[in-house]
């Protein structure tokens, strides 16, 4: 009951090209310690979309202040959506490790579909 769950509340999200897409994710616990990452796709070929710990992701903003104490909301917004952004996005919790963090639990994924820009 108390073990961390990764909640991605939407199975799918549809956004018009040029708009921003909000992908929601939350954790039910602060434990274990470790960062969260967002990926597009699953398996070995997945693409890193956002890393809470490091990196530069100019199109991605976090919906809430991730440095805020006890924050459990890891939702992101991706700006200027194009058809190339379509796919399934996974919010993944990592457990702090040495030398590398270890994947702990993944959300069930949210499929982003992109509609044509309204004329």
């Amino acid at each position: 009951e108390d073990e961390l769950q990764v909640i991605q509340p939407e199975k799918s999200v549809s956004v018009a090209a040029g708009e921003s897409a909000t992908l929601r994710c939350a954790m039910t616990s602060l434990i274990p310690v470790g960062p969260i990452m967002w990926f597009r796709g699953a398996g070995a070929g997945r693409e890193l979309i956002y890393n809470q710990k490091e990196g530069h992701f100019p199109r991605v903003t976090t919906v809430s202040e991730l440095t805020k104490r006890n924050n459990l909301d890891f939702s992101i917004s991706i700006s200027n959506i194009t058809p190339a952004d379509a796919g399934t996005y996974y919010c993944v919790k990592f457990r702090k490790g040495s030398p590398d963090d270890v994947e702990f639990k993944s959300g069930a994924g949210t499929e982003l579909s992109v509609r044509a820009k309204p004329s």
């Epitope: 108390d2 909640i7 991605q8 509340p9 939407e10 199975k11 909301d73």
Partner: antibody
């Protein structure tokens, strides 16, 4: 066994407000949304709005926008629905229901709170 | 908002009958469709979620089908305890909306 316990029946004057509570026990409050559904005498079910406590966000049916406020207190596992500017047509049974993310079905219901609006 | 139209609004049937209730959405909702049963003076009870998944503890005589805009709830052999009102609910968030209900009465 998950239970939702609602506050008792209310009799209100037109123009006043009512606040109904819904306390969850036996489950993980933050893992679900809470919906509020009302049923006027002899009528069908009407979704008023819902809250995702872990995200701190509420959504409302257009019909009730500006007149209903749904909040949640995670520390007490309690959700609240406040309806203002009451009129006789608001006489109804008000239900809270645990709502599962992704498929948004309501699998656990409170017993209902009868609100009577009468001068 | 997505409108949900249920038909019929009421029906009379006998114990053992096969009963079919339909629900139509005003736009495609994929399989985001749930069904509930409600008896007088009681809270609704979930029967079917995601169009065709049977909720735990619900008898197998209840089944759901459909996708897109057209959905069906079927009771394969009506039992005395099944006389109630049935509601569909679309779950293509948000806002959630219910159908108007179908009252199943004893013939």
């Amino acid at each position: 066994q998950v239970q939702l316990v609602q506050s008792g029946a209310e009799v209100k004057k037109p123009g006043s407000s009512v606040k109904v509570s819904c306390k969850a026990s036996g489950g993980t409050f933050s893992s679900y949304a809470i919906s509020w559904v009302r049923q006027a005498p002899g009528q069908g079910l009407e979704w008023m709005g819902g809250i995702a406590p872990i995200f701190g966000t509420a959504n409302y049916a257009q019909k009730f926008q500006g007149r209903v406020t749904i909040t949640a207190d995670e520390s007490t596992s309690t959700a609240y629905m406040e309806l203002s500017s009451l009129r006789s047509e608001d006489t109804a049974v008000y239900y809270c229901a645990r709502t599962t993310y992704r498929d948004y079905y309501m699998d656990v219901w409170g017993k209902g709170t009868t609100v009577t609006v009468s001068s | 908002d997505i409108q949900m139209t249920q038909s019929p609004s009421s029906l009379s049937a006998s114990v053992g009958d096969r009963v079919t209730i339909t629900c139509r959405a005003s736009q495609s909702i994929s399989s985001y469709l749930n069904w509930y049963q409600q008896k007088p003076g009681k809270a609704p009870k979930l029967l079917i979620y995601a169009a065709s998944s049977l909720q735990s503890g619900v008898p197998s005589r209840f089944s759901g089908s459909g996708s897109g805009t057209d959905f069906t709830l079927t009771i394969s052999s009506l039992q005395p305890e099944d006389f109630a009102t049935y509601y569909c609910q679309q779950a293509y968030p948000y806002p959630l909306t219910f159908g108007g209900g179908t009252k199943v009465e004893i013939k």
